[in-house]
């Protein structure tokens, strides 16, 4: 009889331990859910507020068709210019057409006048080929007008309405480009 009572007591204790464990798991799960909910709400809030304020381009960027452009107010060497653009989620300007070139040079005339601006074009040291930063070749009408007499790496820049070349280590303004946000309306 005593053994039976002892067995029942042990079973009850085991059940109690299991229930405590289940409660602990539930509490942990609830805490995890609350945390996830908090992140989710923050994320939604972030998305909604940025969507609410969303114009196709960020402040101080210029829009043309599907692109946004940023004209820098600081000088830097070509490589640092690229990094400055990446910091903003953009790359150095990649000119795809005569129309885009005309828009850029027209905008620069209005904003700043005749300065030098790095674009995402560089000359391969071995082959001498000009390539955009994504590896594509410029169209024939968009090749730098003069070949730089530099032994160092050579990069492309825009000045007035021309595409020219220079030692990548010289300091110039630069132009960044990113895609414009599509309106969902």
């Amino acid at each position: 009889k005593l053994l039976q009572v002892s067995t029942i007591a042990m079973q009850q204790q085991e059940k109690l331990i299991q229930q405590e464990r289940a409660l602990l798991n539930f509490t942990e799960w609830k805490r995890s859910c609350a945390l996830q909910m908090k992140y989710c709400q923050a994320f939604m809030q972030n998305s909604l507020s940025s969507a609410h304020n969303s114009s196709p381009c960020p402040n101080n960027w210029i829009q043309n068709r599907e692109s946004c452009y940023y004209v820098s107010e600081i000088w830097s060497i070509w490589h640092t210019s690229q990094e400055n653009c990446l910091k903003e989620g953009s790359t150095l300007l990649q000119i795809e057409s005569k129309e885009e070139m005309d828009f850029i040079t027209g905008s620069l005339r209005k904003i700043k006048g005749s300065y030098d601006y790095w674009v995402g074009l560089s000359q391969d040291g071995h082959s001498g080929r000009w390539l955009w930063q994504d590896g594509s070749s410029p169209s024939p009408g968009l090749l730098p007008a003069e070949r730089s007499q530099s032994a160092n790496q050579v990069c492309g820049y825009v000045k007035s309405n021309s595409l020219l070349s220079s030692n990548c280590s010289t300091w110039k303004y630069f132009i960044c480009e990113k895609y414009a946000l599509r309106s969902s309306v």
Epitope: T91, G135, Y179
Partner: nanobody
Framework: QVQLQESGGGLVQTGESLSLSCAVA?????????MGWYRQAPEKQRELVAA???????AYADSAKHRFTISKESARNTVHLHMSSLKPEDTAVYYC??????????WGQGTQVTVSS
């Protein structure tokens, strides 16, 4: 706390291929602007190899064009670098990096890539 974990480095022969991956882990939600890979060879400066922006624009160093391919998995905050036709001069420590919306740049610990001739 943002952590970047690289993987995939190793020793290969000239002409072979190698793929590097980098996973971004964060205790909070972060808005990534761009992701990329730098490398640093002994006695040399760290240089940008390839980068990809949030909207998919690409930037490669001249030495990486037509040999290396950068790609990302936005949902998993992961960036990959596939390197083909490797040369001894590609030997370096490769570092993953991200640029985030608040202007910060974060770095991984680096993974060694050695190309033997």
């Amino acid at each position: 706390q943002v952590q970047l974990q690289e993987s995939g480095g190793g020793l290969v022969q000239t002409g072979e291929s190698l793929s590097l991956s980098c996973a971004v882990a964060s205790g909070s939600i972060i808005s990534i602007n761009s992701m990329g890979w730098y490398r640093q060879a002994p006695e040399k400066q760290r240089e940008l190899v390839a980068a990809i922006t949030v909207d998919g624009r690409l930037a490669y160093a001249d030495s990486a064009k037509h040999r290396f391919t950068i790609s990302k998995e936005s949902a998993r905050n992961t960036v990959h670098l596939h390197m083909s036709s490797l040369k001894p001069e590609d030997t370096a420590v490769y570092y993953c990096t991200i640029w985030v919306r608040d202007g910060q740049q974060y770095w991984g610990q680096g993974t060694q890539v050695t190309v033997s001739s």
